[in-house]
């Protein structure tokens, strides 16, 4: 008799794929002809693009009125007219809903100022946030983000209160908190009192770009957080290129999409957007490169392969990889909610298996190093439920040159420098 199927876990929408942060709506528009509509209306015109990325939610803003460092002139219920109107926002919500994209609103109060939380007037600000949560939930948003919570006194208790409001409205609403901290103990203390909170941090940003160190960070985090759902990113707001050299972007995309939890990206991560390559652009929010006309400031600064347009037409581009990974992440049970087992594969490598019941299983092998390596996959580290076969089919490599779909012998696996492999193999009873 066939074994009984394992009961599927209850999954919320943010469990099913990536979140996409658009912190600066004006930068996201691009310059030149991309900048024709007010930013919120302009974003509506980009929803088809966002659908093509298969992202499940947009984290927007902040877009509320905020006069730098002036709590009296900060109104979390009013949209800053530079971004558009409440009507524009309502229209965006409706359009996003039709495309099954959720909208999360960033309510970090003093986003233009020195201290995001007006440190001397915490109670006033907390009341404003409470009122804003209720107002925007009624308006139809799907969740909220608050950043820099290390600057918020009594953050844990405020977050618990805001979580209650959010979940009290609907279990289907999400609260995301962001911190600049990379300290696991600080992160755990924030998570302790808030069971459904999604926390973005700089925890992975000091991974030192070695396989062993990354493996140890990931496994420590998963062990410490138990079976709670987590998110994966390199920071609470910044682009991957702020932390990674270009040659590691593909590797990290593969990793973030295949770890157990919600991957969180910033606009431009899908094309390797890099402020350093755009003279005069701010590191934290460079202009999005839709096509060569998006940055007319310096003629010739932008080549086609840096843009959405150029990369969309290249099956070997970072954008094409992002789309493929996002698609896999959103439809494969083992990647959606499967178990995770990391195991030894030799120095410099990080490898793990994702598996769920009798569904297809996935093996990820990542070479963070500058030299090619042979993988010595130590299957003895794995439980019986996650044993390795002799061969697995190559679903994709982060590097060109491999024949996709071909079976690879796991005993003889060799990885190029900075190469990541995603392999698949069937369940065997």
């Amino acid at each position: 008799r066939a074994p009984r199927c394992r009961e599927l876990p209850a999954q919320k929408w943010w469990h099913t794929g990536a979140l996409y942060r658009i912190g600066d709506l004006q930068a996201f528009q691009g310059h030149g002809a991309g900048n024709l509509a007010a930013p919120i209306s302009g974003l509506k015109g980009r929803l088809d693009y966002l659908s093509s990325l298969k992202v499940k939610g947009l984290v927007l803003g902040p877009i509320h009125k905020n006069q730098k460092d002036d709590v009296a002139q900060t109104d979390l219920l009013q949209i800053d007219p530079n971004f558009g109107s409440k009507e524009d926002f309502d229209s965006l919500l409706q359009s996003a809903k039709k495309k099954s994209i959720r909208v999360i609103l960033d309510l970090t109060p003093n986003y233009r100022g020195e201290n995001s939380w007006f440190s001397t007037q915490v109670d006033t600000v907390a009341t404003k946030v409470k009122d804003a949560l209720e107002f925007w939930l009624q308006a139809g948003v799907d969740g909220f983000q608050v950043r820099d919570i290390e600057n918020l006194k009594d953050a844990s208790s405020f977050l618990a209160e805001w979580q209650n409001i959010t979940k009290g409205f609907s279990e289907d609403r999400l609260l995301i908190a962001g911190t600049n901290s990379s300290d696991l103990q600080q992160i755990l203390s924030l998570l302790e009192s808030n069971k459904d909170l999604l926390l973005t941090s700089s925890y992975l940003s000091d991974s030192g770009s070695t396989g062993e160190h990354t493996k140890s960070l990931v496994t420590q985090y998963l062990n410490a957080t138990g079976n709670r759902w987590c998110s994966w990113s390199l920071s609470q707001a910044r682009l991957l290129t702020s932390f990674l050299p270009a040659q590691l972007l593909r590797l990290y995309q593969l990793m973030l999409f295949t770890l157990p939890g919600t991957p969180v990206f910033s606009y431009g991560d899908e094309i390797g957007l890099d402020a350093a390559a755009l003279p005069g652009q701010p590191m934290e929010a460079p202009v999005m490169l839709w096509d060569e006309s998006s940055f007319p400031d310096i003629p010739g600064a932008v080549s086609a392969n840096m843009t959405v347009k150029g990369q969309s037409e290249d099956p070997g581009s970072l954008l094409s990889l992002f789309r493929r990974l996002s698609d896999q992440r959103s439809k494969e049970r083992s990647l959606l909610h499967g178990d995770f087992h990391a195991f030894s594969a030799g120095p410099g490598l990080f490898s793990y298996i994702r598996h769920w019941d009798q569904n297809e299983r996935f093996l990820v092998v990542l070479n963070f190093g500058d030299v090619g390596l042979s993988a010595g996959l130590q299957a003895s580290d794995l439980p019986a439920s996650a044993s390795l076969p002799a061969k697995a089919d190559l679903l994709l490599s982060t590097q060109p040159g491999r024949e996709e779909g071909s079976p690879l012998e796991l005993e003889r696996l060799k990885l190029e420098p900075h190469e990541g492999l995603l392999l698949r193999f069937p369940y065997a009873a």
């Epitope: 030149g32 002809a33 007010a38 509506k44 088809d48 009507e87 006309s293 959405v308 347009k309």
Partner: antibody, heavy 123, light 108 residues
């Protein structure tokens, strides 16, 4: 409902000027880029000019550059086209429209046209 | 500038017919193509955006397809109100926006 109404057309001699207006209602005019498109008698559609939501970016087709100026007054929900040094080949019905932005992967569902105003340039 | 060429320039058909109009771009425009319908003395009406997405309120007998340089507009079963001129328009990147020269669809 969403509406655009053009006015200001008429018969004018070559070399003279004319100012077209387009009054918008039923949508947040100040949030959208706006275009002028023309259609010569018995001919197809020709894009003329566009202006961004805040007036900071303007673009023109080559044949009108230096002669036509697009502008807007968001407080009055009105779009303008100042046409100087008019030529016989400028004779057309002029439509104002909201067509979205001409950049890669931008798709606007906000596509509204006025009924047009007729400009005839003749001596 | 990107040139748009429609064919045929005019076309006679009967109510109930299936009709196809093609539009070719002088260079690849991905799927950045819109279709409009215009009746005499009226403003153009937006039918299809992004090559194949139907604008709300447009009857499902209209459909669009194609990407790159070759596009088609199909009317699956012509109705009396469909006799008009049809224009394709590219909005691929950077002005100018360009239209095809139009296809006049008349009753046979």
């Amino acid at each position: 409902q969403v509406q655009l109404v053009e006015s200001g057309g008429g018969v004018v001699q070559p070399g003279r000027s004319l100012r077209l207006s387009c009054a918008a209602s039923g949508f947040t005019f100040s949030s959208y880029g706006m275009h002028w498109v023309r259609q010569a008698p018995g001919k197809g559609l020709e894009w003329v000019a566009l202006i961004s939501y805040d007036g900071s970016n303007k673009y023109y087709t080559d044949s009108v550059k230096g002669r036509f100026t697009i502008s807007r007054d968001n407080s009055k929900n009105t779009l303008y086209l100042q046409m100087n040094s008019l030529r016989a080949e400028d004779t057309a019905v002029y439509f104002c429209a909201s067509l979205g932005a001409p950049t890669y992967s931008y798709f606007s569902d906000m596509d509204v046209w006025g009924l047009g105003t007729t400009v005839t340039v003749s001596s | 500038d990107i040139q748009m060429t429609q064919s045929p320039s005019s076309l006679s058909a009967s109510v109930g017919d299936r009709v196809t109009i093609t539009c070719r771009a002088s260079q690849s425009i991905s799927s950045s193509l819109n279709w409009y319908q215009q009746k005499p003395g009226k403003a153009p009406k937006f039918l299809i955006y992004a090559a194949s997405s139907l604008q709300s309120g447009v009857p499902s007998r209209f459909s669009g397809s194609g990407s790159g340089t070759d596009f088609t507009l199909t009317i699956s079963s012509l109705q009396p109100e469909d006799f008009a001129t049809y224009y394709c328009q590219q909005s691929y990147s950077t002005p100018p926006i360009t239209f095809g020269q139009g296809t006049r669809l008349e009753i046979k």
